[in-house]
Structure formats: structure tokens, C-alpha cells
Amino acid sequence: LSTCKTIDMELVKRKRIEAIRGQILSKLRLASPPSQGEVPPGPLPEAVLALYNSTRDRVAGESAEPEPEPEADYYAKEVTRVLMVETHNEIYDKFKQSTHSIYMFFNTSELREAVPEPVLLSRAELRLLRLKLKVEQHVELYQKYSNNSWRYLSNRLLAPSDSPEWLSFDVTGVVRQWLSRGGEIEGFRLSAHCSCDSRDNTLQVDINGFTTGRRGDLATIHGMNRPFLLLMATPLERAQHLQSSRHRR
Amino acid sequence: LSTCKTIDMELVKRKRIEAIRGQILSKLRLASPPSQGEVPPGPLPEAVLALYNSTRDRVAGESAEPEPEPEADYYAKEVTRVLMVETHNEIYDKFKQSTHSIYMFFNTSELREAVPEPVLLSRAELRLLRLKLKVEQHVELYQKYSNNSWRYLSNRLLAPSDSPEWLSFDVTGVVRQWLSRGGEIEGFRLSAHCSCDSRDNTLQVDINGFTTGRRGDLATIHGMNRPFLLLMATPLERAQHLQSSRHRR
Amino acid sequence: DIDECSQDPSLCLPHGACKNLQGSYVCVCDEGFTPTQDQHGCEEVEQPHHKKECYLNFDDTVFCDSVLATNVTQQECCCSLGAGWGDHCEIYPCPVYSSAEFHSLCPDGKGYTQDNNIVNYGIPAHRDIDECMLFGSEICKEGKCVNTQPGYECYCKQGFYYDGNLLECVDVDE
Amino acid sequence: ALDTNYCFSSTEKNCCVRQLYIDFRKDLGWKWIHEPKGYHANFCLGPCPYIWSLDTQYSKVLALYNQHNPGASAAPCCVPQALEPLPIVYYVGRKPKVEQLSNMIVRSCKCS
Amino acid sequence: ALDTNYCFSSTEKNCCVRQLYIDFRKDLGWKWIHEPKGYHANFCLGPCPYIWSLDTQYSKVLALYNQHNPGASAAPCCVPQALEPLPIVYYVGRKPKVEQLSNMIVRSCKCS
């Protein structure tokens, strides 16, 4: 019944595939596929696979993102992760007592190694593995601000759950600040939400990486899943291009 | 340089204009422009203009919204507003004492008149006119839940300011709940954010509609700018169409 | 009386000129353009002799594909069986039957078109639209199409009946 | 919505998201992307009718605007609506890199 | 971005947002919309080149992807990116209504 020209579906697919070839190279700012001459034999390192899986899980958890993206977001972002400083570090000593909070500190030298310039950071997420939770809990995230003051960042209402679950907080602005400042160690605090009337301010939720008494392999596995910052940033070498073409079409 | 046919800009404009003719009628679910036979002479009523301006201001304040919209959002939304129950109403008596909170109650019969079915509501905003503020203040919004309990909804960090400013909180889910329930009067509480350590929990911010001692015209003007709910909803008669065509292309 | 035309000279542009009336104004339109419904603007007249595609209906989501014929005038399409007329999936819906627009496009009613080449006493003659010739293969599948005045008949083989929705001869389910 | 749920299970001729799996090795001849081996890129295809709308239009035609020309374009076009990113692993020299490419997977389409 | 700031001040031939003010009375012959009298609808227009990209492509060509075919479409098309709603006031009988129409004003375009 149709008078339209029949669409050559195979041609459309071929053109889409060829466009994707260019798109991927273009997003990675590569003129041609990278040489594979230095790639060692064998599978990817465990840590790389873990990072890839973290990123893939994040994507699956996101709702399909509606389009608009600033020019810089068109280009690929390198994904790295920086683990929280281990809890036996002396920095934690003066914050050990509280029942309503847990503390997470990060080495800014590790952050700078991953993201040399604040402007290169496009997203930073604080990822916490929440263990089983019997009751609903309202938690708040704070950033260490000055000597002993904390700045409120965000909050989350945690539903009871029988299975562990990754929590993710967007802390892009904070990490960008840290990269701009000279501090050596910076931190977050996760607290129970305290209302002005209520006096029951205990943090019920158990976050992986803070439970004591583990030994051997279990402690290692547990430690690998301790809180970390998932960073997405434009690699330095790619950023140079961006600046030069900033106001061009 | 171009191999394309020259674009007839006038034809494109004409086609865009004609498409807009159909789009507006279609969004309003009108088969043709409405008859103007009953329109009273003279300018639009003040209240209507105020409502139009509120809506227009909201649009200007929004960043340009990226597209995707569910089918129901394609159609026009009727905008209405429901003012907070005045503060001399007895409902406020038992909540007068607190230094850390102010209370806002709404008549659900007025809400139901504006939006007969919860499913028709597409957005509800609580609008508060914030007066001058000398210091930064972190405030939290709660919903009245059961007898004397309050459920946390959201928070806002208010920067110091010399000029009044409208604050807007998205309370769509809450108003939808209210429309589903049988209650006669429902309310919100705006509180100072109380941290677990700090004891300075005074609500510093002055919200229009709560300051006492005004008389005459000033009180009236002041009252008109008291907190209100801005509602966007699909009119009932338009909703019937939507249901019947729900799963069709 | 306010003279709207002198107040706003662009009122009927770009395809017409403004004419002031008591309490209002109308547009006098250029060749090839006709006044809008309220006579406050000019829109292009689709030349009835342009030949385009005739679309069967708007019920089906794939109405771009439901083409009755490919080389017909707006009158031949809209004054007979068509729901819309255009090409490349760019569609002018046919006016609703019995509306003023329908009468303007099809002054002699359903099934007839005006033939400007034959003029009787200064009035264009009307001629029956031969649906079988224009749409035969699409409106009477598996049957024999016979033109009538106005309209058409579709005769099916024994054991088949004509389905007016499908526009084809369908096997009688015994 | 013209999403994978609707489009992959229907024979929609108009604008819809169409299935397309890209295997980096087979389709692009690339062995340098170590993870994933391929991905469901999908694409948008199908006509978006332009309807010349006169005031005399009846509701049936106006109802078509929502799907076929919701943006009232002069030449509506079938384009992606919801997109998702794609993380990849590849080597630069001896160093494996995890990178995320934005807007790579088409989940739904729209006439725009 | 192919937004009003860039496009209205340039002579861009490729995909860009173009100015279009619609006066309800003059352009549509409508007097029934009481507020506003008209609005800046704008529209998207201009080609989005499709670039056949072979691995031999040099960076100059690949750099064009960002603007001309960022979504790697088989037939990229110039369409709205950022849109804004339009509130209107009109009467139904004797009753004035304020309604908001979504996605009516084109603020920027993209090749998609």
C-alpha cells in the first residue's frame, strides 16, 4: 500500500555502524584505533574489572539519561577509584567515639594523581556498601570543612533491606574543591538525621569497611569493598584539545 | 559549496507556524478554537494575571527543560493555586510555641476542587515568599504525617539576601497523597536544620504571611502573598481522552 | 471607528492588503491566496489540480502507508474516499463532511468533482469521480469494482462478502 | 513511549527504536576494546508525518500530533529520546583504562 | 551549544536555532488566547553532515562528529535540544483558565 521508497534497512544499519566507528574514536579523541603492541597477554587485572563493573552497575542503576550534554561531556571520561584511607590510620583517632556518625577520609595526593586539575573532573561519587538494615534510617552526609566544623551536603532515606546494597552520593563539587586546595587529607561524615525534637540519634546502618574483628582473607575482601570515590574525568592530554576548540563550531 | 537544494525559509516558517496551530489545539485537546461568545468585556481579573505571572516566573526560573516527556505531559496543564489557611485558624493554636519551626496548613476541599483526582496532578509546588535574611540558614521541610509526627521531605540552604525571594519546594507526591486520603486539613512544617551536636536551632528566616501586627491594606497585600500551593493538573474532561488512548500509538 | 489598517500596515502581509470596515477589517488576498476563516489573514490556496497521494484514514498508526492512490487531485481524494491528501507523509487532512470547508472543496457533494474545463452557463460542470479507476486495486481487493454515480460497488465471488472496513472481499466463515 | 519495550515487540512502521547489536570485532573489525565485546546500540527509524493543520481539523487528526509531531516541527524527524552511556576498557600502551562514553545506547525515540 | 546566543548572532549555515516570533492574531488569526499576545517559538534548521568514517580518518574529520553527528545517526537531523514551556490564558465560556503548554519554545538545537 505504501508509496514511500522502501527503506534499505541493511544500508541504514551499515551507516549507523560506520557512524559509531567514528563516534567512538572521536569521543576518545583518537585519530585511529590505539596500537595493541604493548598489551600483555592474559585477562584484565582484577582491579580494572572491578572498576569496569562498578561503572557498568552505575549505568544500569541510572534511568536512561535524557540527552542534552555540554560539549565537554561529549568526550569520553576516564574512570578511576580512590579507596578510603584505612580505619587504622591515626586521622580517625579523634573521631572514633560518636554513636551517630562514621567518618571517611581520603588522601588528596591519590585524588590529584587520578585528576590533576579540578576542571577536568566531571563527576565524583562517594560509594558506600550498606550492609543489612533492620529499620528505616534517615542519614545525612557532611563534608569536613575547617578544624572541627562540618558542612551539610545531602541526605538519604534508607529503607530496611535484607541484602547489601551500594549507596552512591554525588560529591563532585566537594572533590573539585579538595583538588583546588592544598590539604593532604579530606573527609566526609555520615550521620543519623537528627530532628530538633527527637533524641534518638543513633546511626543504625552498618557500612562495609567499619566493622572490626575480621581477620585474614575476609578482612582483605571486606577492605576492598570499603568506601571509595568513583571519579570520572577528562584525561589531561584530551583536555588540551578541548581548550583550544572551546568557542568553535 | 552546498549540494543541497536551497531552503525556502519562508515555507519552513509557514509550515512551523501551521504545525504550531495544530500543536496548541492538540495540547489543549480542542478540535477548534473555543467560542469567545461568553467572554466578559474588560481586562483579565487580577487573580488570573497573578497566577499567569507566577507560572511565567516559574518558567523563567527553570533552566530550559531537556525534552523527554511522558505522553500525559504532552497535554496542557491547568494551573491553579490554593492559599494556605490563614494563621488565625484554630488549627495553628497547638503549633504556635516553637522557635525552630513555622507551620502551614491547607484545606483539602480546596485542593480537591482544583484537582478532583490524584492521578490528574502533574506537579505541586509549595511557594513561600522569603523576606530579608541576614545570615545563611539551612532549613528543612516536613509533612504532617499522623497525630503528632512529621515526615521529612527536603531541605534548602538559604543564602543571606537583602531582597525578598520566592522559594519553591516540589511537593507533588505529598499533595497526591492528600488527595487520596480523607483528611480535611493537611500541613507542612518549615524548620531549622538541627545537627546532632549543635544546639542553636532557631529558625532565622522570615516567611511572608507569619509576621503579626499588620493592619488594613498592608495585611491584605501581605496575606495575598502568604504561602500557597501552585498546582498543575490535567483538567478532568481532558483526562477521559487520555485513559482511552493510553496504550495506543 | 478605529482604522486598524492605518494603525498596523502589516496586518495582511505578506500575501494580501488590508481593507478597513466599520469596527473591523478584512484582508483582500493576492492571487493564489485566500482569506483565513476570520478574514484577518491570507493563506495559500492548494491548487485543486495539483496531484498528490490520497491517504485512506487516520485510525491506523501507519497511515503514511495507507495510500489509496498516488496521483490524484485534492478534490478527487477528499470528495470521495480519502481522509487526507499530500505526499511524503506530509498530509493535508480532508475537511470534515458537511463542514463549510467540505462544501467549498466539494460543492457538488460526496462522489463528485468539478471539471473546470467544461463550463455550462458560466458554471463549471460536475463529474462523477470514478473510484474504480482511481483506487480500484486498493478498494476492492479480490473483487470486481463497478463505478456508480456517485460511489462504487464491489462484487465478490461466491462464498465471499465485501468488508467495508478492510475494503476487500473476505471469505464467508461457514 | 517509543521505547524498546514497545518497539521491539511490535511491527511499528512509523518512528520507533530499532534493534542493533554491535559486535566490536565482527562489525568494526576492532580487537582493541577489551570490555565489553559489543553493545546494544540500537537506532531510530521510521516516518514522522507532518500534518497541515487547519482550524477546521477534527480531534482525530489533532490526536496524532502527540506522536507524530509533538514539537510542531516543519519537518519532523525520528531521533533518540532516552540514551544511556557505555563504559569500555581498552589499553593505552601497557596501561588498561576504564572510560565512559556518554549517550551511546538508544533506549527510546521521538518525533522531533 | 547551538543556542540562541550563538545562532542568533551568527550566519551559521549548518544546524542552528532560528528566530521565529509567532503573533497569535497575525500569524494564526486567533484572538482567543488572551495572554501572551505571542511568543518566540523559534525552530531548528540546517544540515547535519553524515561523515563516513573509516579507521584511516584523521583527527580533523573526527573532530566534526561532536557537532555534526554526536549521536552517530545513520541520517542525522537538526532537532530541538533545550525547550521551554509556555503559559497561556484563555476563556472557556465565562471562565478564564491559565494553562501551561510544555516544550513550546526552542532554546537550542542539536544534530541527532
Epitope: 596500537s35 595493541q36 603492541g37 604493548e38 598489551v39 600483555p40 597477554p41 592474559g42 | - | - | 582493541w32 601497557r94 | -
Partner: antibody
Framework: EVQLLESGGGLVQPGGSLRLSCAAS????????MTWVRQAPGKGLEWVSA????????YFADSVKGRFTISRDNSKNTLYLQMNSLRAEDTAVYYC????????????WGQGTLVTVSS | DIQLTQSPSSLSASVGDRVTITCRAS??????LNWYQQKPGKAPKLLIY???NLQSGVPSRFSGSGSGTDFTLTISSLQPEDFATYYC?????????FGGGTKVEIK
């Protein structure tokens, strides 16, 4: 067209040395890791050694570790295998091959050169 | 070292037959397995890489499957030019190792 051409094979006494060469053409030599594989008469294939594109990384089978060295000259598009302390069990046809990707499949092979270790 | 065991070590088949060769690894090697064909007096030729990917230019009657420890090379319809020896190879870890080979002869 990709071409690999081995040379340098021959008869050598146990304990002696030999240097095999593989001349490559038809591709960007420095972009690919290269490898040597051998096949004793009437036997199966045995992997011997490999080298990364820049020559920075080398890999060896246990049976040749400490006796053989692999190297490359990217300016000459040539791969080398220096074989010292040769034994009778090193007698085989030696093939050079291109490592096609990070997956380490050998997509192009030379025609082979015969090394005979015998007194 | 990872051992690869091919079976059978030899088989006789006719033109048009479907032939299946298996390769078992002494530990899991994911999909890091390649298949090669070698004819007498010639260099080996890559058929399948990464367990299931057909190398460019290889006829589609050849296919590979498997993951972990068990892998299969299938020739759907044996042709006269397919009579040769077939080797599997693991690239999961150094040292890289080959299977002992399977000789496909004319029945």
C-alpha cells in the same frame, strides 16, 4: 599485504648459537607484538617467546628461558631470536608470527626456517 | 603451566560430514582460546580467536564455542581442503601453550 620472512636457520652443534631474523612488511611493525613458535619434526606446535611492540616487554617459555633472547629493530621492521646453548631438543622449524591484538592470537605467520641441532 | 588436551588425536571423516574437535584446559581460561589449522609443510593459519570469533577470510562452516575449561571447534560440512591438523592455543597466561593437535584424515 602482510608478509613475514624468516631466515638464519641451519645446522648447528649442541652448545652452539644461532640468530634467527624475521623481516616484516605490509603493516606498521611497531604497533604489533611479535612471537616465535616452533615445531619439532612430526610433533605439535610449541610457543617459544614473544616481545611487545616497543620491545619493552619480553616473554619466554620455561624450556628456553636464560638461553634465548628476543629482540626487534622497529626501524628495520625486523624481529630477532638469539639462540645460545642449543640442545638437540631445540631442533625444529621456527615460525615468526604477528600477535594480532590484546587477545594474543597469531594472525599472520612466516613460512618457517629449519634449525637442526646435531653433532 | 596450563595444559590443553585435545580429543580425538585423529579422526577419519568424509566430505560433507559434520566434525567436532574438543579442547579441555587444566584450569579455567575464560574465552582466551584460539584455534589454528595446519597443512603438511605449511605454516599454521588462524581460524578462530577468543573461543568463538571467526577470523576474517575464514569460511563460515568453521565455528568455535565454549568458555572456562571446555571448548569446541566445529566444521559444519567438511570440504576437501579441510583435511589438516587442528590446534587449540590458550593465551590466558604465560607460558602460552598449544594442544597436542587433532589430525583430520579422509575416510
Amino acid at each position: 599485504e602482510v608478509q613475514l620472512l624468516e631466515s638464519g636457520g641451519g645446522l648447528v652443534q649442541p652448545g652452539g648459537s644461532l640468530r634467527l631474523s624475521c623481516a616484516a612488511s605490509g603493516f606498521t611493525f611497531a604497533d604489533y607484538a611479535m612471537t616465535w613458535v616452533r615445531q619439532a619434526p612430526g610433533k605439535g606446535l610449541e610457543w617459544v617467546s614473544a616481545i611487545s611492540g616497543s620491545g619493552a616487554a619480553t616473554y619466554f617459555a620455561d624450556s628456553v628461558k636464560g638461553r634465548f633472547t628476543i629482540s626487534r629493530d622497529n626501524s628495520k621492521n625486523t624481529l630477532y631470536l638469539q639462540m645460545n646453548s642449543l640442545r638437540a631438543e631445540d631442533t625444529a622449524v621456527y615460525y615468526c608470527a604477528r600477535v594480532s591484538s590484546g587477545h594474543w592470537d597469531f594472525d599472520y605467520w612466516g613460512q618457517g626456517t629449519l634449525v637442526t641441532v646435531s653433532s | 603451566d596450563i595444559q590443553l588436551t585435545q580429543s580425538p588425536s585423529s579422526l577419519s571423516a568424509s566430505v560433507g560430514d559434520r566434525v567436532t574437535i574438543t579442547c579441555r584446559a587444566s584450569q579455567s581460561i575464560s574465552s582466551y582460546l584460539n584455534w589454528y589449522q595446519q597443512k603438511p609443510g605449511k605454516a599454521p593459519k588462524l581460524l578462530i580467536y577468543a573461543a568463538s570469533n571467526l577470523q576474517s577470510g575464514v569460511p563460515s562452516r568453521f565455528s568455535g564455542s565454549g568458555s572456562g575449561t571446555d571448548f569446541t571447534l566445529t566444521i559444519s560440512s567438511l570440504q576437501p581442503e579441510d583435511f589438516a591438523t587442528y590446534y587449540c592455543q590458550q593465551t590466558y597466561t604465560v607460558p602460552l601453550t598449544f594442544g597436542g593437535g587433532t589430525k583430520v584424515e579422509i575416510k
